[in-house]
Every structure is written in structure tokens, then in C-alpha cells.
């Protein structure tokens, strides 16, 4: 038999050459073409375990889009067909609470989760029997990268700033069941860095697949949550990156975000986009913000993979992504996930389990709303699946799709055995369906959040609520004394407010120099190398949120360190949530706060205002009786009619839907 | 471009009195913490908090001993900050300095040198005895 080459082995303490065998009915045959599903035997540790496959059919599209660029830079998006792809999922006959991950493309590679243990598997390199190799996850050599510096390395501050343990309070949540009784779907991007693709020999098939295959182990870990996790799109950088990467995890995840939100968001819609990096950050694994899942601005997330293999990749990814989802660190808290450590342990442990913490922290992001963009299902051109009915996605060519046929008993509209409407159905689902049927144009279906934000009604022909759209970046709020930002107007007092309670209010200026210019976890302007970085004066007021008449101690899930500064007959409040260095700092006052006349706050900078790139003359363009909003279109006040608020009207802009119904305006808002 | 300019300095005798102005150009005054500084001869680069407006048109403060003497109040129609200062005495004697401050907090009035954004160049207020 081949013997395996030191490259493939040499990251594993102990591993086992065995020969899996397909099962058929009527015997034990060798590998055949992809099916449908399929089972093998496989040994491990002196037993057998028959292991029961079936495609991911909700992982990949018809219209599988996967974006690159040429020599010159120019986008090429295209869509190979791989409809008949070779990603499994499944369990271990007799195995309780088993999952599999596997890809059969070129012999089996993936994950076995048994009870007490989990499983790699691989084909064995240069062998011409089909002998692979299977190995404890445990025995995986891994370097000891954390998610982070720990916190509670840093050494205590100096004596004038008197740390305070905040007082005992109830859980604002009981514990609850782990899973969520209703699906969400993650719709995932991910984005290739030129390095990662030169280490991959160029071969954009070889990422490709590879990404693919990092998905559906992704989908393996998420599903004991209740959570789906759906590829709608992949980029690779292959001429070059499109950020720059130099600096610390912290700038390159601001890098990135910024990216996004300017590029991204408006070739594909996703609600989370991970960045995966050849570069490491001295020991950080990864780092993403907390809770921002649905945010245009901040929902996404950093990923060093180097050398490891993708099976451990793929727990810093599901760990990274977790933080998106709401998802603090484990360390410290009364965590279990039936293993050594879990997923969102901040050392990169290689685990393949939530714990119940992380399901409590998801559960309490959509409890807060945080999670809205993660109800709906994947639109039949957005993900990467394969079509089939009863998946729960309504994939091209389906009109609906109520899942199984026990839970399409209770679904009114949809045809379950054939995924189209009934007779009678103009829809099935959708904020503006009820009933099976269209609500009438001009019915709100999603409010106004902020004196920001816009809101948007059914138009009447669609089970769709409009697309989401705000108040330009840029546009003056707040009487004034701030600007909006990504749909909230920023500024430092409801930040405040936010973190310590209704009655707390920004600090003086000169408590932000005072503390800001320390740069130490309690006074800092970001997060560089090893190290916090002090505020040059002109920065402090985008360095860390210092509050005032404070009387609530926050709770986030997690018990934040607090720390009080004398400062001329009062006390400046500033928290750390100690998450860990791979989490931004939600302490931290907001990117787009105003922080002088003219000037807002970007990544601990106090700079020119004018980076909003607003440019709305709302005398000109609204005749003064709208403002512009985020798609640069007018949004007109109720009596004037869009597109420029020149004529009587309804108000509304060409983006939001008809305000009102000739049939019954009592739904005008 | 931002401006602050003083004017009213002089000599006085102990007892007197004297105006200061600042008028401001190029900043949205109203936004702004006007603040009076003072710096004492023969003490380079240690100025003085002496009095100050905040933003919100309400709040003033005063260092403890110009207290019930000297009265700071501004014009927004004018873009200017006033200090009526009574009762000088010779320990007032400095160079006054007007600067200009953007606060998180509306009502904050800042002391520290280092939190303020616009400074004027100074009139000197000379107090005989």
C-alpha cells in the first residue's frame, strides 16, 4: 500500500490508513459517479460505522456565481455549472446526535461527528485502491492561536482609575431551549485574497471547491442551531488585493467592512461576508464584529488560513461567523457543548460544537431584532444549490416551497408536492403576502427606525417588502449636532444611553483626552499589532465612549469591566466588554459620529466629513420638501409627490413603494 | 479658513475695568464652547482657564478667583464671545486668549488647554497698581 507523504501527515499525532467501501443493496462495490445519496462503511478505531450520505442540496446555485478579475482588473463574474456537485451531508447509523460533512470529489474528504469524538478523513495521497486516511480531530497538531490577545493578561491600570465590578444582576433572559424553533438562513459571501489563491496554484477551480466544501462544513456546525448556511457568492481576489492588508487584524477587518459596503453589497445581496487571508496577525486566528449580522456597514468578518487544513480552517470560520451572529466568547462563563472546548472558545480550538452560551447570545440577537435579514429564504437566484423541492428554498423555477410534506399540511398557498401556488394563491410567503394574497400597494412593511431611516410599503404586485433604504450618509440630524449614518444618526449621548441606560449623556471633552490618551484597554484609539493605540488629541473623541450620569450597569451576556475617571466634580463612565482582540470594541464610540464641526469619526479618526461623499442639495433636487436618500433619490414628506417633491402627492420617494391606496387611503402612513 | 480675533486689551488701573471681544470667522459659531485662557508673564505655555461658554447658549464657568468679578457672554448673531472683566486686579495681568471648542456634550464648557480646536493670538491686559 502507498505510504502517506510527510506533507500530509505531518500535522497529525496519530491517524489510520483505511479502505471505505460503498454500499449497495446487493454488495460492497467501489466508488461510482456522484449520487443522489449515498453510504459507506467506514473503520475507525477497530469498528465499523455505516455512514449514511445525501447531497447538500440547499448549499449551491444554479447560477453558482463566483466573481474574479483579469490582468487588467476588469470584474469577470462567472457561473460555472455545477449542478450535480459532489458536497454530502448525513449521520452514523446508530450513532445518536451524529453529523457528517463530507465532499466524495475526488475520494471522501470531511468530518465525522460521533458522540464523543470527531473524525477527519481524506483520501490517501498517490494510492490507487481507494485508501484514505481517518484521524481524531484531537490528534491535530495546531498552533496555539487565539481569536485574540486574552484580556485578562493585561495588567491592572494605574491607581487613579478606579476599576469598578459592576453589581450583581438577574440574567435579562431565563435559559432557554439551544435551538430555535424557527430556521434562519445565513447568506454567505466569501472573498479569496490574492495570497490564499497564489498559495493555491492559481487555480481558481481547486478554491472553487475548496470554499465550497469549507460551506458545507460550515452548514454542519450552524444546523444543531437551527441555522442554515447558504453560499450566494465567492470572490477571489486574483489580481491582486483589493485592500490593503498591511497593518493589524483591526485595520484589515475596517479595511475590509469599508470594502464591502462600497463594492459588494451592490453586486449581491448576503447578510455576512468573510474575508479568508493567507496573512496571520501573530497568533490571531480571525476577527469580526459582534452581533452585526444584518448591518450594511460592519457584517463581516477576517480569516487566516494558512497552514492548516480546511476541516480546522472551518471552525475559525464558524467561530468568526458566530461573533456576526451575536456570539461572545465562551471563557469565563458557565458554558457545555458535550466537548473539551467549543466553538466560540477564543483559542481556535478546532471544535466542531456550539455551546449553549453562543445558542443563548443568537437567541437574544433575535429577540433583539438584530437578526431580520436572516428569516428570509434565499431568492432561487441567490444561492448556491442545487433546485429541489421541498428543501424549504425557493430555488428557480419553484413558486414556493412549504418543505415537507407534513409541514406543507399547514401552509394554506403552497402546493407541496410540486412547489407551485394553489389555484386560488397569488403568493405564499413574504412581508407582503397575507393570506395568499398580495397586500394592497401602499401598506407599510417596514417602519421607519430612526429619524434616519425611510420607510417602505408593499407595491401592491409583489410578496416582496421594497428594498431597504435610509436617509443619505451625511444628512444632518439631531437639531443639528450630528450626522446620519447608515440609517441611525450618530451621536455620543444615545450612544450613551445605549450602553449605561436612558439617563446617561456623553462626557466632557476633556475626561475623552484624558483617558483616550493612555491607550490602554480602558483608553484607546483602536487595536494595532500587539498594542492599544493612544489618541493623538485631535482623535480622542473617536477613541473610547466616555459617559456620564450613569445609573444602569449594562448586561450583554457577558459581565463588562467598568471603569470610572474623576474629572472636574464629575465621573466619566467607560466600559471594556473584554470580548477579546479579534472583537471590536462596541465601547468604542461609532463610526460615523460627528466629532467636530464638519467632521466625523472613521476608524478612530476624526476626519473631513466630506468621506460621507454627501452631495444633496434638498432646496434644489426635493424643492425643499423631501431629502435624499441612500439610493441619492428624494424621499418626499407627506403632500408632495415623488420623484423630485415638485407636485402634490402622497409623499414616499421612487424606491419606497406607493405610500397610499386609491382603494382605501386610511393605509396611508 | 478659521480666525479668532481679540481685541480690547490695555492698561488699567487696580479697580478698573475693561471688554474683551473675540469675533469668529469661518466655523459655525453656535456649534462651538467659547473659552477665555490667560497666560501670566514669564510662565510660557501655561495658560489659564479663566472663563467659559458652552455651546448651548446656557452654561458658564469661571475660574474660582474671577468669580463675582469678570462676566463672559456671547452674541451668536455676531460670531462674537465677550469677557467684561471688573474689579481687575494686578494678578490679572496676562495675555488673554480666546478659544474656540467642539464638545460631545452641548452644556460641556472644556478647561484642559489640549481640548481646545481654535485659538486666537492674544491681547495683553496690563492691570497697574
Known amino acids: 500500500a502507498a505510504r502517506p507523504g510527510f506533507q500530509q501527515t505531518s500535522h497529525l499525532s496519530s491517524y489510520e490508513i483505511i479502505t471505505p467501501w460503498r454500499l449497495t443493496r446487493e454488495r460492497r462495490e467501489a466508488p461510482r459517479p456522484y449520487s443522489k445519496q449515498v453510504s459507506y462503511v467506514i473503520q475507525a478505531e477497530g469498528k465499523e460505522h455505516i455512514i449514511h450520505l445525501e447531497r447538500n442540496k440547499d448549499l449551491l446555485p444554479e447560477d453558482f456565481v463566483v466573481y474574479t478579475y483579469n490582468k487588467e482588473g476588469t470584474l469577470i463574474t462567472d457561473h460555472p455549472n455545477i449542478q450535480n456537485h459532489c458536497h454530502y451531508r448525513g449521520y452514523v447509523e446508530g450513532v445518536h446526535n451524529s453529523s457528517i460533512a463530507l465532499s466524495d470529489c475526488f475520494g471522501l474528504r470531511g468530518l465525522l461527528h460521533l458522540e464523543n469524538a470527531s473524525y477527519g478523513i481524506e483520501p490517501l495521497q498517490n494510492s490507487s485502491h481507494f485508501e484514505h486516511i481517518i484521524y481524531r480531530m484531537d490528534d491535530v497538531y495546531k498552533e496555539p492561536l487565539k481569536c485574540g490577545v486574552s484580556n485578562k493578561d493585561i495588567e491592572k491600570e494605574t491607581a487613579k482609575d478606579e476599576e469598578e465590578e459592576p453589581p450583581s444582576m438577574t440574567q435579562l433572559l431565563r435559559r432557554r431551549r439551544a435551538v430555535l424553533p424557527q430556521t434562519r438562513y445565513v447568506e454567505l459571501f466569501i472573498v479569496v485574497d490574492k495570497e490564499r489563491y497564489d498559495m493555491m496554484g492559481r487555480n481558481q477551480t481547486a478554491v472553487r471547491e475548496e470554499m465550497i466544501l469549507l460551506a458545507n462544513y460550515l452548514d454542519s456546525m450552524y444546523i444543531m442551531l437551527n441555522i442554515r448556511i447558504v453560499l450566494v457568492g465567492l470572490e477571489i481576489w486574483t489580481n491582486g488585493n483589493l485592500i490593503n492588508i498591511v497593518g493589524g487584524a483591526g485595520d484589515v477587518l475596517g479595511n475590509f467592512v469599508q470594502w464591502r459596503e462600497k463594492f459588494l453589497i451592490t453586486r449581491r445581496r448576503h447578510d455576512s461576508a468573510q474575508l479568508v487571508l493567507k496573512k496571520g496577525f501573530g497568533g490571531t486566528a480571525g476577527m469580526a464584529f459582534v452581533g452585526t449580522v444584518c448591518s450594511r456597514s460592519h457584517a463581516g468578518g477576517i480569516n487566516v488560513f494558512g497552514q492548516i487544513t480546511v476541516e480546522t480552517f472551518a471552525s475559525i470560520v464558524a467561530h468568526e461567523l458566530g461573533h456576526n451572529l451575536g456570539m461572545n466568547h465562551d471563557d469565563g462563563r458557565d458554558c457545555s457543548c458535550g466537548a473539551k472546548s467549543c466553538i466560540m472558545n477564543s483559542g481556535a480550538s478546532g471544535s466542531r460544537n456550539f455551546s449553549s452560551c453562543s445558542a443563548e447570545d443568537f437567541e437574544k440577537l433575535t429577540l433583539n431584532k438584530g437578526g431580520n435579514c436572516l428569516l428570509n429564504i434565499p431568492k432561487p437566484d441567490e444561492a448556491y444549490s442545487a433546485p429541489s423541492c421541498g428543501n424549504k428554498l425557493v430555488d428557480a423555477g419553484e413558486e414556493c416551497d412549504c418543505g415537507t410534506p407534513k409541514e406543507c399540511e399547514l401552509d394554506p398557498c403552497c402546493e407541496g408536492s410540486t412547489c407551485k401556488l394553489k389555484s386560488f394563491a397569488e403568493c405564499a410567503y413574504g412581508d407582503c403576502c397575507k393570506d395568499c394574497r398580495f397586500l394592497p400597494g401602499g401598506t407599510l412593511c417596514r417602519g421607519k427606525t430612526s429619524e434616519c431611516d425611510v420607510p417602505e410599503y408593499c407595491n401592491g404586485s409583489s410578496q416582496f417588502c421594497q428594498p431597504d433604504v435610509f436617509i443619505q450618509n451625511g444628512y444632518p440630524c439631531q437639531n443639528n449636532k450630528a450626522y446620519c449614518y447608515n440609517g441611525m444618526c450618530q451621536y455620543y449621548d444615545a450612544q450613551c444611553q445605549v450602553i449605561f441606560g436612558s439617563k446617561a449623556k456623553a462626557a466632557p471633552k476633556d475626561c475623552f483626552i484624558e483617558v483616550n490618551s493612555k491607550g490602554d484597554r480602558f483608553g484607546n484609539c483602536g487595536f494595532s499589532g500587539n498594542e492599544y493605540k493612544k489618541c493623538a488629541t485631535g482623535n480622542a473623541l473617536c477613541g473610547k465612549l466616555q459617559c456620564e450620569n450613569v445609573q444602569e450597569i449594562p448586561v450583554f451576556g457577558i459581565v463588562p469591566a467598568i471603569i470610572q475617571t474623576p474629572s472636574r466634580g464629575t465621573k466619566c463612565w467607560g466600559v471594556d466588554f473584554q470580548l477579546g482582540s479579534d472583537v471590536p470594541d462596541p465601547g468604542m464610540v461609532n463610526e460615523g459620529t460627528k466629532c467636530g464641526a464638519g467632521k466625523i469619526c472613521r476608524n478612530f479618526q476624526c476626519v473631513d466629513a466630506s468621506v460621507l461623499n454627501y452631495d444633496c442639495d434638498v432646496q434644489k433636487k426635493c424643492h425643499g420638501h423631501g431629502v435624499c436618500n441612500s439610493n441619492k433619490n428624494c424621499h418626499c414628506e407627506n403632500g408632495w409627490a415623488p420623484p423630485n417633491c415638485e407636485t402634490k402627492g402622497y409623499g414616499g420617494s421612487v424606491d419606497s413603494g406607493p405610500t397610499y391606496n386609491e382603494m382605501n387611503t386610511a393605509l396611508r402612513d | 479658513e478659521v480666525h479668532l480675533v481679540e481685541s480690547g486689551g490695555g492698561v488699567v488701573q487696580a479697580g478698573g475695568s475693561l471688554r474683551l471681544s473675540c469675533v469668529a470667522s469661518g466655523l459655525p459659531f453656535s456649534e462651538y464652547a467659547l473659552v477665555w485662557f490667560r497666560q501670566a508673564p514669564g510662565k510660557e505655555k501655561e495658560r489659564e482657564f479663566v472663563a467659559g461658554f458652552a455651546a448651548n447658549g446656557i452654561n458658564t464657568d469661571y475660574t474660582d478667583s474671577v468669580k463675582g468679578r469678570f462676566t463672559i457672554s456671547r452674541d451668536n448673531a455676531k460670531n462674537t464671545v465677550y469677557l467684561q472683566m471688573n474689579s481687575l486686579k494686578p494678578e490679572d495681568t496676562a495675555v488673554y486668549y480666546c478659544?474656540?471648542?467642539?464638545?460631545?456634550?452641548?452644556?460641556?464648557?472644556?478647561?484642559?488647554?489640549?481640548?481646545?480646536?481654535?485659538w486666537g493670538k492674544g491681547t495683553l491686559v496690563t492691570v497697574s497698581s
Open positions: 478659544a474656540a471648542s467642539w464638545t460631545p456634550a452641548y452644556n460641556d464648557i472644556p478647561r484642559h488647554m489640549s481640548s481646545m480646536d481654535q
